[in-house]
């Protein structure tokens, strides 16, 4: 996160850290807890690393430096990448992770509500992006979970800023015209959440951007509302019933 500040314990209890353990262990992506046994993240996090057993998922944590060999983590039972995601495109950058064992909810570890299917009418004015990603383009992973308040921008405006890319209605963009605040490398897969009528909803999944926090280059996020059918289909067919945190 560029231009952010430290988060507090329990402030973003749905935020998880997706880490890979090969010779060393490192944080690669964020994710959002959406049910006892489900995490929503970006498909591109698994490019070149599709093996389930190399991944460790840490939930209910604030500081990555607090993680030791004794810190409990979740393992992956199944990675479900959107069937239309292609490594040659930026579309459908969404994936579900089914955990091997369900998580208990606590003050520091609980799910984010999902938006309504095809939610286009809600005007979100209080949106935040969180993650342990770089604090500048040529930066490094941060220890303490960072947060930043970023306004949504229209897809029309976003397309003007990204003429060389196709911004679809299944994407949502957020950023300041002057730059300075944005997601960055290592924040991929993490949440863009917006508070509406007193409730936090998962509006976007951190996907891509041209650099980080550059002027007139907003961040681009996978629009969760556009994938509600897919999320429900995959979680129900795997579980027999949905265990999602739907909006009240």
């Amino acid at each position: 996160i560029v231009g952010g500040t430290n988060s507090s314990w329990g402030e973003w209890p749905w935020q998880v850290s997706l880490q890979v353990k090969l010779t060393a262990q490192r944080h690669l992506c964020g994710g959002s807890l959406i049910g006892h046994q489900w995490v929503l993240t970006a498909a591109h996090c698994f490019d070149g690393l599709p093996l389930q057993d190399v991944w460790r998922i840490y939930s209910g944590i604030l500081n990555l430096s607090d993680i030791t060999k004794d810190t409990p983590f979740s393992q992956i039972k199944e990675i479900i990448i959107h069937q239309n995601y292609k490594v040659s495109e930026g579309n459908h950058d969404i994936a579900l992770i089914k955990l091997q064992a369900p998580l208990n909810y606590t003050e520091f570890q609980k799910p984010i509500c999902l938006p309504s299917k095809g939610d286009t009418s809600t005007i979100y004015t209080n949106c935040w992006v969180t993650g342990w990603g770089f604090s500048k383009e040529k930066g490094e992973i941060q220890n303490i979970l960072q947060k930043v308040n970023i306004p949504l921008v229209t897809n029309e405006e976003c397309q003007k800023r990204y003429q060389d890319y196709k911004i679809t209605q299944r994407m949502v963009c957020a950023g300041y015209k002057e730059g300075g605040k944005d997601a960055c490398k290592g924040d991929s897969g993490g949440p863009l959440v917006c508070k509406h009528n007193g409730m936090w909803r998962l509006v976007g999944i951190t996907s891509w951007g041209e650099g980080c926090a550059r002027r007139e280059q907003p961040g681009v996020y996978t629009k969760v509302a556009e994938y509600m059918d897919w999320i429900l289909e995959k979680t129900q067919s795997s579980d027999g019933k949905a265990q999602m945190q739907s909006p009240a």
Partner: antibody, heavy 125, light 108 residues
Framework: EVQLLESGGGLVQPGGSLRLSCAAS????????MTWVRQAPGKGLEWVSY????????IYADSVKGRFTISRDNSKNTLYLQMNSLRAEDTAVYYC??????????????????WGQGTLVTVSS | DIQMTQSPGTLSLSPGERATLSCRTS???????LAWYQQTPGQAPRLLIY???SRATGIPDRFSGTGYGTDFTLTISRLEPEDYGTYYC?????????FGQGTRVEIK
């Protein structure tokens, strides 16, 4: 299956014009950046131009700027290269290519993942 | 413009040998925008590596790419008969996009 098929090459005199076409199939053409690359006989590859998915943004190599125009018709899934004021040094095989733009580490990647078979343009008197 | 300098110009190797091709750039190139292509005589180029290190679809794992900043390498761990040809590095980090002059890999 992704396919790109160039046409329109041939022999033309210096100062003449030619329009190359590239018919695309097997993918959503309107979502992709497209590019032209050329290769003079026995030489290496030289990037010529690219065009954004909507067609609203174009960039050219200095060697062709002001003489070549790239365009596209998304309704026909076709890419074009209008070549005017041709010179002997424009003699080359011209390839159209699809520009893939994936995502890696919250940035985009850019690479030419599919190429046509090429069409030969010969500029000679 | 970003100049791409490939070395060596020609590499003479026997099947089964390891090939190491170098690509140096005149300015910093974001790894996401560095690709390698293979071209055999009379054929269009074929994408091998993108993002400096990711193998394109269908490319065997004997091909690998590494590098960062201004220094990139393509390695073919064990040459197969079909690997002989010319290899190009290419950057799309900044316009104009540019290719290296190529490295020819020939049978020894």
């Amino acid at each position: 299956e992704v396919q790109l098929l160039e046409s329109g090459g041939g022999l033309v005199q210096p100062g003449g014009s030619l329009r190359l076409s590239c018919a695309a199939s097997g993918f959503t053409f309107s979502h992709y950046l497209m590019t032209w690359v050329r290769q003079a006989p026995g030489k290496g590859l030289e990037w010529v131009s690219y065009i954004s998915p909507s067609g609203g943004h174009t960039i050219y190599a200095d060697s062709v700027k002001g003489r070549f125009t790239i365009s596209r018709d998304n309704s026909k899934n076709t890419l074009y290269l209008q070549m005017n004021s041709l010179r002997a040094e424009d003699t080359a095989v011209y390839y159209c290519a699809r520009v893939a733009q994936g995502i890696a580490a919250r940035s985009r990647t850019t690479q030419f993942d599919y190429w046509g078979q090429g069409t030969l343009v010969t500029v000679s008197s | 413009d970003i100049q791409m300098t490939q070395s060596p110009g020609t590499l003479s190797l026997s099947p089964g040998e390891r090939a190491t091709l170098s690509c140096r750039t005149s300015q910093f190139v974001n790894s996401n925008y560095l690709a390698w292509y293979q071209q055999t005589p009379g054929q269009a180029p074929r994408l091998l590596i993108y993002g400096a290190s990711s193998r394109a679809t269908g490319i065997p794992d004997r091909f690998s790419g590494t590098g960062y900043g201004t220094d990139f390498t393509l390695t073919i761990s064990r040459l197969e008969p079909e690997d002989y040809g010319t290899y190009y590095c290419q950057q799309s980090s900044r316009t104009p996009w540019t290719f290296g002059q190529g490295t020819r890999v020939e049978i020894k």
